[in-house]
């Protein structure tokens, strides 16, 4: 067959409509004309094109092609002529003030905040050179400059991640069923069963030493005693493979030694050697029958009609002549649309093609990052470029702790808590919010003062039973919480001053809650008999179930606002899964009884997902797109529960519709709640009243008794419509008509007595500090039987 990319020797042929005929008579899709790509391969599709001027935000390649300015000198050639990465272009590049130069031999600029963060972002590691010691006196500084509590040094675990905390340690004695690598040389301890198992477990390979294992070392090519049977070949890397696999063209040994030292040209003179090394009779070469296993005896045989010589066979790109007929194929990044024409593959249809933004181009795609993030050119992931270093904040029943994700230093934010499970943060104000199940209170404090019991403000300390989930709406300044004892979901202003029950029906065991103030939605998990994940507007409108199948004990949920996906952990199914905000595109990222023994809290940031696990008493992380790269961030944590990321990019600024309105608080007398932004016609907010009051016909003022009006109806999230006469205390949709798409009717429980002899701050009996059962059932015993209640938590 002829060169498939050459065309035009045959008679002229008209191209189909929607195609452009090249000078060489190839046919290409018309849309490829004047797109700055030589698709014809004779440049005729790019001739006589109007001169293009690049935008100010673009870089003009030497050949006139336009690319984004930010792609210049990014280590990848985007200009067809490579001029965006040329020495001339990049050496004259000066890094802006907020960027750091990677040194004189590099033209790369990285965000200044990446300096001394423990990750080498410059090729030569210039961003990590000469960094000062950051660790406190009682901490150990790892080789990668992360900080570690001194207790973790020489404990047998690689806590630094680079092994530096375990170097130069006094040799611990190996256990009774362990083997010391390197003999008396002070090597690591490995299980005895790993010795002489044909796998190198010791760095010095001493566990497979010939004198120890009673056989030649794994380096021998094929010593008879090296493998169990004579029909096996001993790889130099220690394993045994089938003898027939030796010199068969496939690399079966880890070190490929089964294909080393193989004789070349082993076929006889009357034989043809196939591509895979096997031999067939020479007469079978080019006999129009495939005799070699790989078909190489018929490759390159010229006979019959070569359709590719005529108009490239009608193929838009590659034409391959076959024994019978021909075949059109496409270069990388393209796929056949109609057996002949190649069209671009939209790699961006795969939601995991990029960590953030995917931009599809003809024949390739490019990953980009949202504002505030920058592409790490080494990992190709988007990393936070702005603000302080991110940290993880988590609860462990009696404390709230913090781990700096860059320096890896570990601190206690709030000590001496009775039974804290849920928490959240407000980054802009540097505040932390938490619920204590024993005190039955929701608290708040400034992060730097949170350890001081005098500074812990009480937001909610009435009509609270078991607040297990908490979320802060940082835009509209509200807190939302679930109460598994009262079986309610409520909202209050961040100072606790104004509150309302949003849902009091169809909740069994509500647990985690998360909010999306940018779009006006909240999401929560319920691990009751009919376990589910639900969603509604932040005003309680449009309640819907997102997940109800293949779900058992959904504990933590978290939102990735950028990719618009919800992640959750299921402690019964031992799974970490995600869905989009509409409940579609469900993915199980990790399914593991080891890493997800009893997961509780979950958080997402950059390219990672983090979760707490009660049984492992640890915090894990993994790649949020594919669930790979699972690692332990912290262990021996004693009941780690809720977990959040503290970083400004987790809480993007957005307008508060209630404050943007002409009247303060949206004109609402009590609560102004954001409405879900379902369409461009969606109301921006609705007004709401306390649980014991009713909204008037103006949809703004609150009244002790329902106002009689024929025009006002309440559309309940449960029953859709109720007559005006049975109107409940309500929230409203702010519209010109009095259509009240409201929350469900709260069930008004008996009033709490005004005088109680003993406050709801039950004592802790040590026996009930941990979950009620050893296998971490979903229930906790609340620590005071006098209160007559149990608090449930995973």
């Amino acid at each position: 067959a002829a060169d498939p990319l050459l065309g035009g020797q045959g008679p002229a042929k008209d191209c189909e409509k929607d195609q452009f005929q090249c000078r060489n008579e190839r046919c290409i899709p018309s849309v490829w004309r004047c797109d700055e790509d030589d698709d014809c391969l004779d440049h005729s599709d790019e001739d006589d094109c109007p001169k293009k001027t690049c935008a100010d935000s673009d870089f003009t390649c030497d050949n006139g092609h336009c690319i984004h300015e930010r792609w210049k000198c990014d280590g990848e050639e985007e200009c067809p002529d490579g001029s965006d990465e040329s020495e001339a272009t990049c050496t004259k590049q000066v890094c802006p003030a907020e960027k750091l130069s990677c040194g004189p031999t590099s033209h790369k600029c990285v965000p200044a905040s990446w300096r001394c963060d423990g990750e080498k972002d410059c090729e030569g590691g210039a961003d990590e050179a000469g960094c000062a010691t950051l660790c406190a006196p009682h901490e150990f500084q790892c080789g990668n400059r992360s900080c570690l509590a001194a207790v973790f040094v020489c404990d047998g675990d690689d806590d630094c991640g680079d092994g530096s905390d375990e170097r130069g340690c006094a040799d611990p004695a190996c256990g009774p069923r362990e083997f010391r690598c390197g003999g008396d040389g002070g090597g690591a301890c490995i299980p005895e069963r790993w010795v002489c198992d044909r796998q190198f477990d010791c760095e010095d390979r001493s566990d497979e030493a010939a004198e120890l294992c009673g056989r030649p070392g794994p380096g021998a090519t094929s010593a008879p005693a090296a493998c169990a049977t004579a029909s096996q070949f001993a790889c130099r890397s220690g394993e045994c493979v089938h003898l027939g696999w030796r010199c068969d063209g496939d690399r079966d040994c880890k070190d490929k030694s089964d294909e080393a030292d193989c004789p070349l040209g082993t076929c006889r003179g009357d034989e043809f050697q196939c591509g895979d090394g096997t031999c067939v009779l020479a007469i079978k070469h080019c006999n129009q029958e495939q005799d070699c296993p790989d078909g190489s005896d018929e490759a390159g045989c010229l006979q019959g009609l070569n359709e590719c010589l005529h108009n490239n066979g009608g193929c838009s790109h590659i034409c391959t002549d076959l024994k019978i007929g021909f075949e059109c194929t496409c270069p990388a990044g393209f796929q056949l649309l109609d057996q002949k024409t190649c069209g671009d593959i939209d790699e961006c249809k795969d939601p995991d093609a990029c960590s953030q933004i995917c931009v599809n181009y003809k024949g390739y795609f490019k990953c980009e990052c949202y504002p505030g993030y920058e592409m790490d050119l080494l990992t190709k992931n988007c990393k936070a470029a702005a603000g302080k270093s991110p940290s993880l904040i988590f609860t462990n029943r009696h404390e709230v702790r913090r781990i700096d994700l860059v320096k890896r230093n570990y601190s206690r934010l709030i000590p001496m808590l009775k039974n804290v499970v849920a928490l959240d943060v407000e980054v802009a104000t540097n505040r932390i919010y938490w619920c204590d199940l024993s005190y039955r209170k929701i608290y708040s404090a400034y992060m730097d003062k949170a350890s001081d019991p005098k500074e812990q403000e009480v937001l909610i300390d009435e009509q609270l039973h078991s607040p297990e989930g908490l979320a802060v709406d940082w835009v509209h300044k509200h807190i939302y919480w679930t109460d598994s004892g009262n079986k309610t979901i409520s909202v209050a202003t961040v100072d606790g001053g104004r509150r309302r029950t949003l849902f009091s029906r169809n909740l069994s065991e509500p647990r985690a809650i998360a909010v999306d103030p940018l779009r006006g939605f909240m999401y929560w998990s319920d691990w009751g008999d009919q376990a589910k994940i639900e969603k509604s507007g932040l005003n309680g409108v449009d309640r819907q179930t997102l997940v109800s199948d293949n779900i058992e004990w959904p504990n933590g949920i978290t939102l990735d606002l950028l990719s618009q996906r919800l992640y959750w952990v299921d402690s019964k199914l031992h799974q970490l899964s995600s869905i989009d905000f509409s409940g579609g595109n469900r993915k199980t990222l990790i399914s593991s009884t080891d890493f997800l023994s009893h997961p509780f809290g979950i958080a997402v940031f950059e390219d990672k997902v983090f979760w707490t696990d009660l049984e492992n008493e640890a915090i894990f992380s993994a790649n949020r797109l594919n669930g790979l790269e699972i690692s332990i961030l912290a262990e021996n944590l004693n009941n780690p529960h809720d977990i959040v990321i503290f970083h400004e990019l987790k809480q993007p600024r957005a307008p508060d519709a209630c404050e943007l309105s002409v009247q303060p608080n949206g004109g609402c007398e009590y609560l102004c709640l954001p409405a879900p932004q379902i369409s461009s016609h969606s109301p921006k907010y609705t007004c709401a009243c306390p649980d014991t009051m009713w909204l008037g016909p103006d949809m703004k003022r609150c009244y002790r008794a329902p106002q009689s009006t024929s025009t006002t109806t309440l559309a309940s999230t449960m029953t859709r419509t109720v007559p005006a006469t049975t109107r409940a205390p309500g929230t409203t949709v702010h519209r010109s008509t009095y259509q009240n798409h409201s929350t469900e009717t709260p069930s008004l429980t008996a009033a709490v007595p005004s005088s109680v002899s003993v406050p709801r701050a039950p004592s802790i009996s040590p026996s009930t500090l941990s979950p009620a059962t050893s296998n971490h059932s979903q229930h906790y015993a609340n620590e005071d039987s006098k209160m007559g209640s149990t608090v449930t938590a995973a």
């Epitope: 019991p453 009480v458 009435e462 100072d495 003993v758 701050a761 004592s763 802790i764």
Partner: antibody
């Protein structure tokens, strides 16, 4: 700066009533539970009552239950203690307190209540 | 209610001396213990919370220790301004209760 100023103390006959007030300033009054603690002359300290942030929950020591009522007005940043059926053993300096978690964080200067015929 | 037994009821110390005051709870209070100093004619001031955390502005010669049911307040290098009554208070469970107080005088 946190300031708590008590008023309303004085001499009162047994069986009569008296109302103490406490004006709070320098902090978000509605964000903290408030309490009254008393100290009889040359005696130790004794917790009397606590009120929750919005006034919905009140807690009392057994000896004053049914006679004393603690309340608050968040709009006025004021704490109250209504004392009825006063007894001679109620004689003490009464301190207005901003509670902290598990402790009494800030104390007023105190107001003396003397129950005597 | 949890009873708090404080000892001694009173003690006197010389300038620069180290003194200790003990507080015994009738049940485990898990370090939810605070110490207050009350000077004559004044209201009590918080010194130490959570058994061993020093309140801001309190001199470092004051220190708290203990766990379970037994706690102590130590004042090293006694100063004239340290005279007064010291109270312990448990915050583990309502009703919060105080010890009877210890009167500290300068010799």
């Amino acid at each position: 700066e946190v300031q708590l100023v008590e008023s309303g103390g004085g001499l009162v006959q047994p069986g009569r009533s008296m109302k103490l007030s406490c004006a709070a300033s320098g902090f978000t009054f509605s964000s903290f539970p408030m309490a009254w603690v008393r100290q009889a002359p040359t005696k130790g300290l004794e917790w009397v009552a606590t009120v929750s942030t919005r006034g919905g929950h009140t807690y009392y020591r057994d000896s004053v239950k049914g006679r004393f009522t603690i309340s608050r007005d968040n709009a006025k940043n004021t704490l109250y203690l209504q004392m009825n059926s006063l007894r001679s053993e109620d004689t003490a300096t009464y301190y207005c307190i901003r509670e902290g978690t598990s402790l009494f964080a800030y104390w007023g200067q105190g107001t003396l209540v003397t129950v005597s015929s | 209610d949890i009873q708090m037994t404080q000892s001694p009821p009173s003690l006197s110390a010389s300038l620069g001396e180290t003194v200790s005051i003990e507080c015994l709870a009738s049940e485990d209070i898990s370090n939810y213990l605070a110490w207050y100093q009350q000077k004559p004619g004044k209201s009590p001031q918080l010194l130490i919370y959570y058994a061993n955390s020093l309140e801001d502005g309190v001199p470092s010669r004051f220190s708290g220790s203990g766990s379970g049911t037994q706690y102590s307040l130590k004042i090293s290098n006694m100063q004239p301004e340290d005279e007064g009554v010291y109270h312990c208070q448990q915050g583990y469970n309502y009703p919060y209760t105080f010890g009877a107080g210890t009167k500290l005088e300068l010799k």
